[in-house]
């Protein structure tokens, strides 16, 4: 019968011929009366056999990631009679893995959006690298993820590639972050190969800023001939938030005379001071009113940022009109 062990050949061997093992018949007594032959895909080009001894050699550099096993057939013939000594047999040569592939991130580019002020531990995104090496062969394809750029705001779980927030971020200070993740095979041991990817993390706005008046004091004038409903001037607050979170409402906080009103122009986000009652220069020619401004939409959990509304004082001077 045939005698052989399992055949393995390491990939990427640079030698011109590499001895893999020996195929022989147990009828072979070593007097060179038998001839061994190799048949099948790769026979003669990738693998050769010593016809006398049955020793098999790889004569080409192999790449496991291209082809991980070869199925060949062996024959043994009695040279004197030309007849088969053993029935033709099929055998396998397995290409064994070496760590010749670095981890690759296949889903690039990565981009994620996360609300500003999210608590520590909030999941941002999961990045995944793949390694073409053999996952069943040692640690060649066992990956560890680490953060090359992004501290102290982000962290990555070493085995899963899950990126989490590790420190609260304020969109109004910085609205996007580039995080660089490295994946290393060999679980980071010597000889490891690595690959990197960039993740763009954008912060979405939350209503963590209240509107604040641009000026703490305004001066307006109104003619005593102005009819009720007249717009006598505008006041303006700014809000570092954006979109809906920056929409505001102006109102009167203090006007003992009940002479003025404030309406909000929701397009410009300005407050328009309106004359509610006609004024009379001879009766009163100086007014002082206090206005306040608040956001239009404030979720309950963000009320802590909006405890005290910003206020401004408006001095209104009445201009005299000569009466007939």
């Amino acid at each position: 019968g045939w005698v052989w062990n399992q055949f393995f050949v390491p990939e990427e061997m640079n030698t011109t011929s590499h001895h893999i093992g020996q195929l022989r018949s147990d009828l072979d007594n070593g007097n060179n009366s038998f001839q061994y032959k190799l048949l099948g895909a790769g026979a003669g080009s990738t693998f050769i056999i010593d016809e006398r001894t049955g020793d098999i050699y790889a004569i080409q550099k192999l790449d496991r990631e291209e082809r991980s096993l070869y199925i060949l057939r062996a024959q043994v013939i009695d040279i004197a009679t030309g007849r088969a000594v053993e029935p033709e047999s099929e055998f396998v040569i397995k290409v064994s893995d070496i760590n010749d592939n670095e981890p690759k991130f296949l889903d690039e580019p990565y981009e994620a959006i996360v609300p500003e002020m999210s608590p520590e531990g909030t999941l941002v995104i999961q990045v995944t690298a793949s390694d073409a090496d053999d996952p069943s062969s040692g640690n060649n394809a066992r990956l560890l993820y680490s953060l090359l750029q992004g501290q102290p705001y982000f962290s990555v779980e070493p085995t899963t590639g899950v990126i989490r927030i590790s420190s609260k971020m304020d969109r109004e200070l910085q609205d996007e972050y580039w995080v660089i993740i490295q994946a290393k095979d060999m679980i980071g041991q010597p000889g490891a190969l690595s690959g990197t990817t960039s993740v763009l993390i954008k912060l979405s706005d939350v209503n963590d800023n209240k509107p604040i008046f641009k000026e703490s004091l305004y001066r307006l004038t109104v003619s005593e001939s102005a009819p009720t409903g007249t717009s006598i001037g505008t006041i303006m607050a700014y809000d570092n938030d954006i979109g809906e979170n920056a929409e505001m409402d102006y109102s009167i906080e203090e006007d003992d005379s009940q002479t003025f009103d404030i309406i909000t122009n929701h397009e410009t986000q300005e407050g328009i001071v309106i004359l509610k009652k006609k004024v009379d220069f001879e009766h009163q020619n100086h007014y002082g009113i206090r206005a306040k401004v608040k956001n239009h939409h404030v979720p309950e959990q963000l009320m802590k940022y909006h405890t005290e509304a910003s206020t401004t004082f408006i001095k209104i001077q009445v201009e005299d009109v000569d009466e007939p």
């Epitope: 004091l217 020619n285 002082g288």
Partner: antibody, heavy 120, light 107 residues
Framework: QVQLQESGPGLVKPSETLSLTCTVS??????????WSWIRQPPGKGLEWIGY???????YYNPSLKSRVTISVDTSKNQFSLKLSSVTAADTAVYYC????????????WGQGTLVTVSS | EIVLTQSPGTLSLSPGERATLSCRAS???????LAWYQQKPGQAPRLLIY???SRATGIPDRFSGSGSGTDFTLTISRLEPEDFTVYYC????????FGPGTKVDIK
Amino acid sequence: QVQLQESGPGLVKPSETLSLTCTVSGGSISSSGYYWSWIRQPPGKGLEWIGYIYYTGSAYYNPSLKSRVTISVDTSKNQFSLKLSSVTAADTAVYYCARDGSSGWYFQYWGQGTLVTVSS
Amino acid sequence: EIVLTQSPGTLSLSPGERATLSCRASRQISSSYLAWYQQKPGQAPRLLIYGPSSRATGIPDRFSGSGSGTDFTLTISRLEPEDFTVYYCQQYGSSFTFGPGTKVDIK
């Protein structure tokens, strides 16, 4: 802290024009919303408001003095000035410059005052 | 114009006593438009109270203001030696007018 300092002649002849200047330091005269006033106090008597000016040049005067008063402003020098024409002995007083408040038309900051005597 | 009348003209009290100074307007004014000043001899007036009950910066809490309509009051809860001087009320709704003053002197 805003500081105000009056300057000008201490003696003016009757029928002449009294001229005083107030120099503002520790703040800009062009600050939005603030009015700059002149107030006077005859010796041993009460206070009388003369008029005010806004940094844009808009002025408003006490109706009883309106015909004789001019208040002007020089934002480049951070100063405002008072001119009171056709003075009489009744105009002898300590003259104060003042700035109104951030929450109303009251007088929050005052100069230390300068005595102007009208006498021949 | 609005005329302000202050009473009494002179108030004689001892240190530690309570002083109540009155200011009456010739017609109704909004309480937001009244202020009180203190003036010591040879000095400029100093703002005490505005609007009519807000204390100006640095003013001790023994000074308080109240009132509405035509009647306003400045109260000094416990007179200190430095409080014996002249006090003026001022309205700033219709032009600007001052009261004639109340002198607080030591009894």
